[in-house]
């Protein structure tokens, strides 16, 4: 009988006939070992490879270019899955990006993405997307034109100020651009007029910081 | 290369009106909020006007209020301030200053036009 | 309106030696979220003013490092480590914290 083929991503695993959202083992191309990745397999069909999550602010997410890299966190809770390893995974195939939103008053959202996928760490790991629909704004609040990676010691944004430093986080900052998925968690009350909370600037606002996040990936042709 | 270039002053007589205009380049210019910053002669700086990205939302000082409007034109990427009723204390240079972050997070200024001198006097 | 206040109004120093320069505000300049929106700009004679420091003390980007923004609340410092000739100008600084912006009435440095 000839040899299952390992699982490249989340919709591999629900193909496989794992249909139940929860944590898998996943082996990307090019990259030495294989990664834990959360597997959202209820959300639209299914087959959802989390790239991002949080939900509770027991993570500290002001890291550095190094830890933004290669993963930070459990992919049981808040996480950040890696640069190399969201480079890697969107090379294999095309891929598309949901990202499920709730603000702090129980609503909940999503923006999604018909193409995604990042450069490589010399491309500052830039962002690439095209066809944005969703509940979470009529605009985009990714930045649709290209943007490259910041964290607090690499400074790759469009702006005369370091957006990394003075909104907390990794992300694909502009000037400093409409959101920042990876800024500073603040709980109910505490979540209005921040300047680097957790934004999605079509969804809530310039300064609302929300309540939890999700960023996923699928395959186009699932 | 961020530009602000203006243009529109000259001499005018007290009461008359001028409009003053900034084009941008170089940037997103819908994406920015907007200020016109002054400096009488030999003074100091005094804001006198805001307009957010969309246009949606505007300021003014409360000693141009009732006589100045700003206003914007995304489409042409310019900046623009009409001024009526002028008086002799308008007299200063008038300069447009881009808001330093976009989407309306307010941190100050990060660019400035080169500044345009409006001289009221009869 | 909040009235905010430089000290001194004029500086002479010597290229090479340090300069400071104070602002003070007639209220907290201390945001809700934590950051106080106090900038500084520089005016060169004959120019534009520029950025020099946001947010009290970051520095905008291809501001030498010898600039340095320190305070909180009310009351706030410019420090230049090491003047040089091209430090020359009307040291401004404005706050945004509380509206309508309002900056205070300007630092001449000069090149003794």
């Known amino acids: 009988r000839e040899e299952e083929k390992p699982f490249r991503d989340c919709a591999d695993v629900y193909q496989a006939g794992f249909n139940k959202s929860g944590i898998y083992t996943i082996y990307i191309n090019n990259m030495p070992e294989p990664k834990k990745v959360f597997c959202n397999m209820d959300v639209n069909g299914g087959g959802w490879t989390v790239i991002q999550h949080r939900e509770d602010g027991s993570l500290d997410f002001q890291r550095g270019w190094k830890e933004y890299k290669m993963g930070f966190g459990n992919p049981s809770g808040e996480y950040w899955l890696g640069n190399e390893f969201i480079f890697a995974i969107t090379s294999q195939r095309q891929y598309m990006l949901r990202i499920e939103l709730m603000d702090w008053e129980g609503n909940r959202a999503y923006s999604q993405y018909d193409r995604f996928h990042i450069g490589n760490e010399k491309q500052n790991y830039r962002l690439y997307l095209k066809g944005h629909t969703g509940t979470a704004g009529k605009q985009s609040s990714l930045i649709l034109h290209g943007a490259d990676f910041s964290t607090k010691d690499a400074d790759n944004d469009n702006c005369m100020c370091k957006c990394a430093l003075m909104l907390t986080g990794g992300w694909w900052f502009d000037a400093c651009g409409p959101s920042n998925l990876n800024g500073m968690f603040y709980t109910a009350g505490q979540n209005h007029g921040k300047l680097n909370g957790i934004k999605w600037h079509y969804f809530k606002g310039p300064s609302y910081s929300l309540r939890s996040t999700t960023m996923m990936i699928r395959p186009l042709d699932f | 290369e961020v530009q602000l270039v203006q243009s529109g002053g000259g001499v005018v007589q007290p009461g008359r009106s001028l409009r003053l205009s900034c084009a941008a380049s170089?940037?997103?210019?819908?994406?920015?909020?907007m200020h016109w910053v002054r400096q009488a002669p030999g003074k100091g700086l005094e804001w006198v006007s805001y307009i957010s990205s969309s246009g949606s939302t505007i300021y003014y000082a409360d000693s141009v209020k009732g006589r100045f409007t700003i206003s914007r034109d995304n489409a042409k990427n310019s900046l623009y301030l009409q001024m009526n009723s002028l008086r002799a204390e308008d007299t200063a240079v008038y300069y447009c200053?881009?808001?330093?972050?976009?989407?309306?997070?307010?941190?100050?200024?990060?660019?400035w036009g080169q500044g345009t001198l409006v001289t009221v006097s009869s | 309106d909040i009235v905010m206040t430089q000290s001194p109004l004029s500086l002479p120093v010597t290229p090479g030696e340090p300069a400071s320069i104070s602002c003070r505000s007639s209220q907290s300049l201390l945001h809700s979220n934590g950051y106080n929106y106090l900038d500084w700009y520089l005016q060169k004679p004959g120019q534009s003013p520029q950025l020099l420091i946001y947010l009290g003390s970051d520095r905008a980007s291809g501001v030498p490092d010898r600039f340095s923004g320190s305070g909180s609340g009310t009351d706030f410092t410019l420090k230049i480590s090491r003047v040089e000739a091209e430090d020359v100008g009307v040291y401004y600084c404005?706050?945004?914290?509380?509206?309508?912006?309002?900056f205070g009435q300007g630092t001449k440095l000069e090149i003794k």
């Open positions: 404005m706050q945004g914290t509380h509206w309508p912006p309002t």
């Open positions: 170089g940037f997103t210019f819908s994406s920015y909020g």
């Open positions: 200053a881009r808001d330093l972050l976009d989407y309306d997070i307010w941190t100050g200024y990060g660019y």
